[in-house]
């Protein structure tokens, strides 16, 4: 069976600055030279694309300039960082990996990483 398994952590807590990082690792059944990584957010039954990047193996992962994601790749592992998160963005973030070239195409979808985001408390006014 030539299936592609994708692994990602079950839970990640975003930093107080609204930044969350996690690793998306895939077991490639072939020798892909072009890979597409997409981060999906599932909330209830709604699925939205958070960001996506296509990269050539051995090269850096490049998201669009206005993307809230950044990342680096190393072999079959992608280190993803999502920034600008707020409490309302808490949810399940799913890593989708596609081996685009050469044929055959393969799809792999992770089980998702539950990212918890806690908005920082505003600093209390000082009496001093």
């Amino acid at each position: 069976c030539k299936a592609m398994h994708v692994a990602q952590p079950a839970v990640v807590l975003a930093s107080s600055r609204g930044i969350a990082s996690f690793v998306c690792e895939y077991a490639s059944p072939g020798k892909a030279t072009e890979v597409r990584v997409t981060v999906l957010r599932q909330a209830d039954s709604q699925v939205t694309e958070v960001c996506a990047a296509t990269y050539m193996m051995g090269n850096e992962l490049t998201f669009l300039d206005d993307s809230i994601c950044t990342g680096t790749s190393s072999g079959n592992q992608v280190n993803l960082t999502i920034q600008g998160l707020r409490a309302m963005d808490t949810g399940l973030y799913i890593c989708k990996v596609e081996l685009m070239y050469p044929p055959p195409y393969y799809l792999g979808i992770g089980n998702g990483t539950q990212i918890y985001v806690i908005d920082p408390e505003p600093c209390p006014d000082s009496d001093f």
């Epitope: 299936a3 592609m4 597409r36 996506a52 296509t54 685009m100 070239y101 055959p104 799809l107 979808i109």
Partner: antibody
Framework: QVQLVESGGGVVQPGRSLRLSCAAS????????MHWVRQAPGKGLEWVAV????????YYADSLKGRFTISRDISKNTLYLQMNSLRDEDTAVYYC???????????WGQGTMVTVSS | EIVLTQSPGTLSLSPGERATLSCRAS?????LAWYQQKPGQAPRLLIY???SRATGIPDRFSGSGSGTDFTLTISRLEPEDFAVYYC?????????FGQGTKVEIK
Amino acid sequence: QVQLVESGGGVVQPGRSLRLSCAASGFTFSSYGMHWVRQAPGKGLEWVAVTWYDGRNKYYADSLKGRFTISRDISKNTLYLQMNSLRDEDTAVYYCARGGSYGAFDIWGQGTMVTVSS
Amino acid sequence: EIVLTQSPGTLSLSPGERATLSCRASQSVSYLAWYQQKPGQAPRLLIYGASSRATGIPDRFSGSGSGTDFTLTISRLEPEDFAVYYCQHYGSSPWTFGQGTKVEIK
């Protein structure tokens, strides 16, 4: 709303060419793989081709032997299927379908009928 | 190429009855979908990932299975459920469909 509308079908003689179009609306066209699937009269579904995202990578069913070409125009939100050297066995309803976020074909057009006959 | 074999070819049932449709793959598949098609209409996605219901699909439709054996169950057939059902694998190219199971009124 999210919609796919095919056009370009009709009756054509064997050996001739035809180009099908699929107009997409209601979603970001470049964020999805787009497929063509066909269905011969009274038969099942047969996958034909896919074009990915920016349109560079394309895959075809082996049975088509290079006669069909899939393409997309992102500026027009339109998917195409150029069919050359048509044969009787290409007679079918041709559907365009969106490869959804999780990979399955979540949105389908209404289909366009192609009849190859002399 | 992964070959999907559906059984039975035709299922004759009455409204209110339970329908069980089978799809067997020639090799293990990771991603399997089910579609419903009514005469003169395009297919409609019912189930993806073997068991997840697509948006707007009633909960009387359920999918199960893994590896090479998959099942679509319609718990209580409604008049609008009489149609042809196709399974499909979509985890790698080429994408393939089963030959279909027709659910008809007995």
